[in-house]
C-alpha cells in the first residue's frame, strides 16, 4: 500500500490531494487556506454537520502562517495540547476558542505559540503507530466557555461505543472542499477484528477504527483532532483510506488509552 502524507501538502506539494491514487492510505492533515472554497451543502466532515457553538472548547487549530489550518489538536491541560505526531511542524501557531475556519476575529478566541513539541518516541514517519505528540503552549489558557481542557480516557474503547469526532477538514473526497465552521460527526467504535480486516497487517493496539456504513468519516485536515467518547478524549484523528468515507474502510484513530502514562509523565517532566 502506498503511503501519502498530506499533512504538509500546503507547503511542499509532494502529493497534491487530487493526485493521490484511489485506495491508498493517507494521513489526515491538510492545508486549508483562509480563502479555501467553503461548502454550502449539508455535506460536512464527510456527512457530519456544523457543531453547536461552545460544545468543543478543547478543539484547537494548528496554523501555518498567515492563517492556514493544517491540523487539529486537543487541549488536555491548561498549557498542553495533544495532536498527531505526523502533524509536527517547526513553526506554527495555535488557535483555541474559534468556531469558523476563516481567520475573522471571534471574541472567544485565544492565540498561542507552541514552545515545545514532543512526538511520541515510538512514532515512525511515514508509519501510523504511536501517532501522537504533545505541544506545550507559551502560556496557560484563560479558561472560558470557549476554551477548556478535556480529560484523556484511561479506559480503552469497546466496540459499539458512540463517539464524536470534530474538525475543519475537507467535507468532500477526493475533491477538497473546506467547511465554514467546525464540523461534528457521530461515529461508532468498531471491533479490532473489523479494523484489522479493513486494513490487513496495518493495525496495532495503538490504533482503533471508527465509522459507520453510511459514508461518515473524518478526512484530510482533521488530523490530530479529538474523538470524544462518554465525555472524555478517547482518540485522535490519524489516518484512513483515500478517498475518505469509502465503504468498509473506516477512519483510524490513535488509541489514547495506551498512552495515559506517557502523556502524564511527559507533561510533568516538561512543566
Amino acid at each position: 500500500v502506498t503511503e501519502h502524507v498530506l499533512a504538509n501538502n500546503d507547503v511542499s506539494c509532494d502529493h497534491p490531494s487530487n493526485t493521490v491514487p484511489s485506495g491508498s492510505n493517507q494521513d489526515l492533515g491538510a492545508g486549508a487556506g483562509e480563502d479555501a472554497r467553503s461548502d454550502d451543502s449539508s455535506s460536512r466532515i464527510i456527512n457530519g454537520s456544523d457543531c453547536d457553538m461552545h460544545t468543543q472548547p478543547w478543539q484547537a487549530a494548528l496554523l501555518l502562517r498567515p492563517n492556514q489550518l493544517y491540523c487539529g489538536a486537543v487541549l488536555v491541560h491548561p498549557q498542553w495540547l495533544l495532536t498527531a505526531a505526523h502533524c509536527r511542524k517547526k513553526v506554527f501557531r495555535v488557535r483555541l476558542g474559534h468556531y469558523s475556519l476563516s481567520p475573522v476575529y471571534e471574541s472567544g478566541q485565544q492565540m498561542f505559540q507552541g514552545v515545545k513539541s514532543i512526538p511520541h518516541p515510538g512514532y515512525s514517519h511515514p508509519g501510523h503507530s504511536n501517532d501522537l505528540m504533545l505541544i506545550k503552549l507559551n502560556r496557560r489558557i484563560r479558561p472560558t466557555k470557549d476554551v477548556r481542557p478535556i480529560n484523556v480516557s484511561s479506559h480503552c474503547p469497546s466496540a459499539g461505543t458512540k463517539c464524536l469526532v470534530s474538525g475543519w477538514g475537507t467535507t468532500k473526497s477526493p475533491q477538497v472542499h473546506f467547511p465554514k465552521v467546525l464540523q461534528c460527526l457521530n461515529i461508532s467504535v468498531l471491533s479490532q477484528k473489523r479494523c484489522e480486516d479493513a486494513y490487513p497487517r496495518q493495525i496495532d493496539d495503538t490504533m482503533f477504527c471508527a465509522g459507520d456504513k453510511a459514508g461518515r468519516d473524518s478526512c484530510q485536515g482533521d488530523s490530530g483532532g479529538p474523538v470524544v467518547c462518554n465525555g472524555s478524549l478517547q482518540g485522535l484523528v490519524s489516518w484512513g483510506d483515500y478517498p475518505c468515507a469509502r465503504p468498509n474502510r473506516p477512519g483510524v484513530y490513535t488509541n489514547l488509552c495506551k498512552f495515559t502514562k506517557w502523556i502524564q509523565e511527559t507533561i510533568q517532566a516538561n512543566s
Epitope: 511542499s12 502562517r65 513553526v91 515510538g122 507559551n138
Partner: antibody
Framework: EVQLQESGPGLVKPSGTLSLTCAVS????????MSWVRQPPGKGLEWIGD???????DYASWAKGRVTISVDSSKTQVSLKLSSVTAADTAVYYC???????????WGQGTLVTVSS | AIDMTQSPSSLSASVGDRVTITCQAS??????LAWYQQKPGKAPKLLIY???TLASGVPSRFSGSGSGTDFTLTISSLQPEDFATYYC????????????FGGGTKVEIK
C-alpha cells in the same frame, strides 16, 4: 532568490565578543525558524541555537549564558553574539533556514571568524 | 541529552560502489533525522529529512531509512561528485543538547 549572507569581523580578540549578522532575502522570516551552526577548522558541524518567529530561542547547552541570537526590528536580519571568546571559538559560522520539517534547507556561504590577539 | 554517533568516521570507496553510513542516537528520536552533504570550503547541503524524505533536487541514488535510534544513509551507486563529508542531525529535541549533529563521515576515493 532565496539567500542568506553572513557578515561580521573576521578577527576577534580573546575575551571579546563575536558579533555576526545574517542577511535574509527571498522569504519572510516570520514563516521560518533560523539556526546558527559553526565549524571549527578541520572539524565537524556544531549547532549553536535556533530562533523562531515568535522570538522563542533554543541554545545548545554549551552556549547558554554566552550566546545571544536575535532578529532585528526590520525582520530582515538574524544576529549572533558570542561573548568571552577563546581560540576554541575560531570557526566558520553559518546561518541556515529550517524547512519547517526539521531540515536545514538554505545555508549561507559561511564566514570565518578567528579569535586571536 | 541526546548524542548522535556516526560510523564509520571515514571510508574509502570507488565510483559505482554502494555506500552505507549509519547514525545512532543515544535515545529514540522517532523519525526526526536529517542528512547533509558537505564539500571542502562549501556550506552543507540538505539531502534527506524526516529520516527518509529526499530534499528537493537531490538525486534518487541517495536514500535514508531508520527510526527510533538507528538510521542509515545509502548511496546506491557512488558518483564522482559524491566524494564529500556527510553529517546526520537530530530534530527531535533541542532541550539540554550539546550538539544536534553527528561527528561526520568522510567518503574518500579508494
Amino acid at each position: 532568490e532565496v539567500q542568506l549572507q553572513e557578515s561580521g569581523p573576521g578577527l576577534v580578540k580573546p575575551s571579546g565578543t563575536l558579533s555576526l549578522t545574517c542577511a535574509v532575502s527571498g522569504f519572510p522570516l516570520s514563516n521560518y525558524a533560523m539556526s546558527w551552526v559553526r565549524q571549527p577548522p578541520g572539524k565537524g558541524l556544531e549547532w549553536i541555537g535556533d530562533i523562531y518567529p515568535s522570538d522563542i530561542i533554543d541554545y545548545a547547552s554549551w552556549a547558554k549564558g554566552r550566546v545571544t541570537i536575535s532578529v532585528d526590528s526590520s525582520k530582515t536580519q538574524v544576529s549572533l553574539k558570542l561573548s568571552s571568546v577563546t581560540a576554541a571559538d575560531t570557526a566558520v559560522y553559518y546561518c541556515a533556514r529550517d524547512n519547517n520539517d526539521y531540515g536545514l534547507d538554505i545555508w549561507g556561504q559561511g564566514t570565518l571568524v578567528t579569535v586571536s590577539s | 541529552a541526546i548524542d548522535m554517533t556516526q560510523s564509520p568516521s571515514s571510508l574509502s570507496a570507488s565510483v559505482g560502489d554502494r555506500v552505507t553510513i549509519t547514525c545512532q542516537a543515544s535515545q529514540s528520536i522517532s523519525s526526526w533525522l536529517a542528512w547533509y552533504q558537505q564539500k571542502p570550503g562549501k556550506a552543507p547541503k540538505l539531502l534527506i529529512y524526516l529520516a527518509s524524505t529526499l530534499a528537493s533536487g537531490v538525486p534518487s541514488r541517495f536514500s535514508g531509512s531508520g527510526s527510533g535510534t538507528d538510521f542509515t544513509l545509502t548511496i546506491s551507486s557512488l558518483q564522482p561528485e559524491d566524494f564529500a563529508t556527510y553529517y546526520c542531525q537530530q530534530g527531535y529535541t533541542n532541550s539540554n543538547i550539546i550538539n544536534t549533529f553527528g561527528g561526520g563521515t568522510k567518503v574518500e576515493i579508494k
